[in-house]
Interface confidence: low
C-alpha cells in the first residue's frame, strides 16, 4: 500500500496529510488485486495535483472515487476511460479550475460532486451549468466560478457569449434503399464553440466511410446489407457544452428468403413452422402437392412474431388427418423477388395402417411459433374451404 495510505481488499484510503501522496495511489505488484478495489478515498492530500491518463485504469471495478480537501488541479481526459463501473465521483474542495465533460461522457454517473473548486468562469465549464439545469434531483450543488475580477459567481448565473449547445441537422435522401445499393447521408453541424462532427452508426454491418470538413460531414454506405434494415444512423455534434444529434432509420428493401421451414409439430394445433425474411413484407402463398392451398379457418397462416423484417409463424392445421399428408410448399414473394421451400408432412397413417411403418416425425413443441398471441395475422380469408380434408389428388401415402 502506498505511503500515507491504507488498503483493504476492496478499498484504498489516503487521509494522512503528512507525508502525503504526490501521485494517485498505485498498488504494488503481488499485493491486492486492483480489479477488486471498489472504493478509493483520498483526503488532505495537498500535493496530489494531477490524475494522469493511466493512473486509474487498473481499478476497473471502481465504483466510488472520492478526492476531497486535496490539491487536484488537472485530470487527464482519458483518466476514467476504463472505469465503466464508476457511479460516484466526489472532487469537493480541490484546486480544479476547469473540468471537461469529456472526462465523464462515457460513464453512467449517479453523482458528480464538485463543490468548493476554484473553477474559472469560461466556456469550459458551461456543461456543468447545463448538467445542473437538467438534473431532476432537488439537491443541486452550489457551484461557483471565479470571474475576471476573481469574484465568486454562482454557476447558475454564468453567461458566456458564444458558448452554447451545438446543433446537428441530417439531410438524408429517402432512406429506403434496395439491398446491395449505396446511399450517402449529409450532415451539417453548427454552434459556438464550433462543434466536432461524428457519426454514430451503431452495429452497422454494411461498409461505410465518412468524410468530415469543418461543419459538414458525409457518410457513404455501400453494398447495403439487408441486416441493416431498421438500424438507426445518427450525426452527432459535440462541443465543450454538450452534444446534439439528428437520426434517421435505414430501411432496406430486399427479396424474400425462407430461412426456416420444418416438418409439422403438434401443440394446441398442428403447426408447420417457418421463418421468412423480406422487405417490404412478403406475401405468403402455400401449395399442397403442387396445387394452391386455399386457406380457411381450419388451415391458415399465422404470424406469431415479427422482428422487423423477419416473420416467424406457422401454417396452422386443425385436426389434420391422413388426407392432409403430403408436400407443403411455402412461397414468399414481394416486388424484389420470391423464394420457395418445401417440406413433407405426415400427420397420421391411413386407418388400418400400422403407424410404425411410417416415418418417425418428432413431436417437438415449437413454442416460438405456437404462442396463443398472434402478431400480424396474415390469414387469407378470400378462398375459404370447408374443412381440413383437402383432396389428396396424388393419392400418395407418407
Amino acid at each position: 500500500c502506498p505511503t500515507s495510505c491504507k488498503c483493504s481488499s476492496a478499498r484504498i484510503w489516503c487521509t494522512e496529510p503528512s507525508p502525503g501522496i504526490v501521485a494517485f495511489p498505485r498498488l504494488e505488484p503481488n499485493s491486492v488485486d486492483p480489479e477488486n478495489i471498489t472504493e478509493i478515498l483520498i483526503a488532505n492530500q495537498k500535493r496530489l495535483e494531477i490524475i494522469n491518463e493511466d493512473d486509474v485504469e487498473a481499478y476497473v471495478g471502481l465504483r466510488n472515487l472520492t478526492i476531497v480537501d486535496s490539491g487536484l488541479k488537472f485530470v487527464a481526459y482519458k483518466a476514467f476511460l476504463k472505469n465503466s463501473n464508476l457511479r460516484h465521483i466526489n472532487f469537493t474542495r480541490n484546486k480544479l479550475t476547469s473540468l471537461s465533460r469529456r472526462h465523464f461522457r462515457h460513464l453512467d454517473l449517479s453523482d458528480l460532486i464538485l463543490t468548493g473548486n476554484p473553477f474559472t468562469c469560461s466556456c469550459d465549464i458551461m456543461w456543468l451549468k447545463t448538467l445542473q439545469e437538467t438534473k431532476s434531483s432537488p439537491d443541486t450543488q452550489d457551484l461557483y466560478c471565479l470571474n475576471e475580477s476573481s469574484k465568486n459567481m454562482p454557476l447558475a448565473n454564468l453567461q458566456i457569449p458564444n458558448c452554447g449547445l451545438p446543433s446537428a441537422r441530417l439531410a438524408a435522401p429517402n432512406l429506403t434503399v434496395e439491398e446491395g445499393k449505396s446511399v450517402t447521408l449529409s450532415c451539417s453541424v453548427g454552434g459556438d464553440p464550433l462543434p466536432t462532427l461524428y457519426w454514430d452508426v451503431g452495429n452497422l454491418v454494411s461498409k461505410h466511410m465518412n468524410e468530415t470538413s469543418h461543419t459538414q460531414g458525409s457518410l457513404r454506405i455501400t453494398n447495403i446489407s439487408s441486416d441493416d434494415s431498421g438500424k438507426q444512423i445518427s450525426c452527432v455534434a459535440e462541443n465543450l457544452v454538450g452534444e446534439d444529434q439528428d437520426s434517421v432509420n435505414l430501411t432496406v428493401h430486399f427479396a424474400p428468403t425462407i430461412t426456416f421451414l420444418e416438418s409439422p409439430t403438434s401443440d394446441h394445433h398442428w403447426c408447420i413452422p417457418f421463418t421468412v425474411r423480406g422487405n417490404p413484407k412478403p406475401a405468403l402463398q402455400w401449395f399442397y402437392n403442387g396445387a394452391i392451398l386455399n386457406e380457411s379457418k381450419y388451415i391458415c397462416t399465422k404470424i406469431h412474431v415479427t422482428n422487423h423484417t423477419e416473420y416467424h409463424g406457422c401454417l396452422q392445421l386443425d385436426n389434420p388427418t391422413h388426407m392432409n399428408n403430403g408436400d407443403y410448399t411455402l412461397m414468399a414473394k414481394n416486388e424484389y423477388g420470391k423464394d420457395e421451400r418445401q417440406i413433407s408432412a405426415h400427420f397420421m397413417g391411413r386407418p388400418g395402417v400400422d403407424y410404425e411403418t411410417n416415418p418417425n416425425y418428432p413431436e417437438v413443441l415449437y413454442e416460438d411459433w405456437t404462442t396463443p398471441t398472434d402478431i400480424g395475422d396474415t390469414t387469407n380469408k378470400s378462398n375459404e374451404i370447408p374443412s381440413t380434408d383437402v383432396a389428396d389428388q396424388s393419392n400418395r401415402e407418407h
Partner: antibody
Framework: QVQLVESGAEVKKPGESLKISCKGS????????IAWVRQMPGKGLEWMGI????????RYSPSFQGQVTISADKSISTAYLQWSSLKASDTAMYYC?????????WGQGTMVTVSS | QAGLTQPPSASGTPGQRVTISCSGS????????VSWYRQIPGTAPKFLLY???QRPSGVPARFSGSKSGTSASLAVDGLQSDDEADYYC???????????FGTGTKLTVL
C-alpha cells in the same frame, strides 16, 4: 534517461515569426504537462504557460495570453512555442520543463534574439 | 503578474547555514505547495525541492525546505563554494490558474 532537448538559438528581426521546439524522451510524453518559462537577460524566471501533450489542452499566463502560441505534436513527442510577430522585448532565453510534482526536468534553453 | 517575493541576495561563509525566504499570498503558497530551483548563470535551472520540503534523488540533504502560512523558506546547511547560484521558489497560483516564480535570490559564498 528522461530529458528535454530544445532547438537551437535564433536571431530574428522584429515582425518576423518563429517557432521553437522541445523534444521529450525517456518517459511517457503524453502523460506529463510541459511548461514554457522565459528568462530575459539578467532577469528572473517567468512562467508562460503549459500544455498537456496527450490532448493539447493549453493554459497561458495572463501576461502571455495572445502573445504566444503553445502547441504539441504527441506523435513526435515535441512541444512548441511560437510567435507570429516578434518584438525586441521578446529577446530572452526560453526553457521548457516537465511538470512532475514540480518542474522536475528542464530543457537546455533556446536563446531568442530579436534585433533590427 | 504578481510573483513571489524573495530577497535579491543572500550570503554566507563556507560551512554556515543560509536561509532564503519566499513570500506569497493565500492563492499561491497559502494553498499550494512550493518548489525550489537552482540556476548557475548561463545554464538551465535545476530541480531542487518540491512539495515544500521533498528532495528529488541526487539533491544533497544539506538542502531543506519549509512552509508556514503564505511564506516558505529554503535552508542550505554547510555552505559550499559551489552552492553559489541563483535560487528561485515557485508555486501554483489558484487565482491565476498558473505557476508563479519568486523574484530570485543570488546566493554568494564569501
Amino acid at each position: 534517461q528522461v530529458q528535454l532537448v530544445e532547438s537551437g538559438a535564433e536571431v530574428k528581426k522584429p515582425g518576423e515569426s518563429l517557432k521553437i521546439s522541445c523534444k521529450g524522451s525517456g518517459y511517457s510524453f503524453t502523460t506529463y504537462w510541459i511548461a514554457w518559462v522565459r528568462q530575459m537577460p539578467g532577469k528572473g524566471l517567468e512562467w508562460m504557460g503549459i500544455i498537456y501533450p496527450g490532448d493539447s489542452d493549453t493554459r497561458y499566463s495572463p501576461s502571455f495570453q495572445g502573445q504566444v502560441t503553445i502547441s504539441a505534436d504527441k506523435s513526435i513527442s515535441t512541444a512548441y512555442l511560437q510567435w507570429s510577430s516578434l518584438k525586441a522585448s521578446d529577446t530572452a532565453m526560453y526553457y521548457c520543463a516537465r511538470l512532475g510534482g514540480g518542474m522536475d526536468v528542464w530543457g537546455q534553453g533556446t536563446m531568442v534574439t530579436v534585433s533590427s | 503578474q504578481a510573483g513571489l517575493t524573495q530577497p535579491p541576495s543572500a550570503s554566507g561563509t563556507p560551512g554556515q547555514r543560509v536561509t532564503i525566504s519566499c513570500s506569497g499570498s493565500s492563492s499561491n503558497i497559502g494553498s499550494n505547495t512550493v518548489s525550489w530551483y537552482r540556476q548557475i548563470p548561463g545554464t538551465a535551472p535545476k530541480f531542487l525541492l518540491y512539495g515544500n520540503n521533498q528532495r528529488p534523488s541526487g539533491v544533497p540533504a544539506r538542502f531543506s525546505g519549509s512552509k508556514s502560512g503564505t511564506s516558505a523558506s529554503l535552508a542550505v546547511d554547510g555552505l559550499q563554494s559551489d552552492d553559489e547560484a541563483d535560487y528561485y521558489c515557485a508555486a501554483w497560483d489558484d487565482s491565476l490558474s498558473g505557476y508563479v516564480f519568486g523574484t530570485g535570490t543570488k546566493l554568494t559564498v564569501l
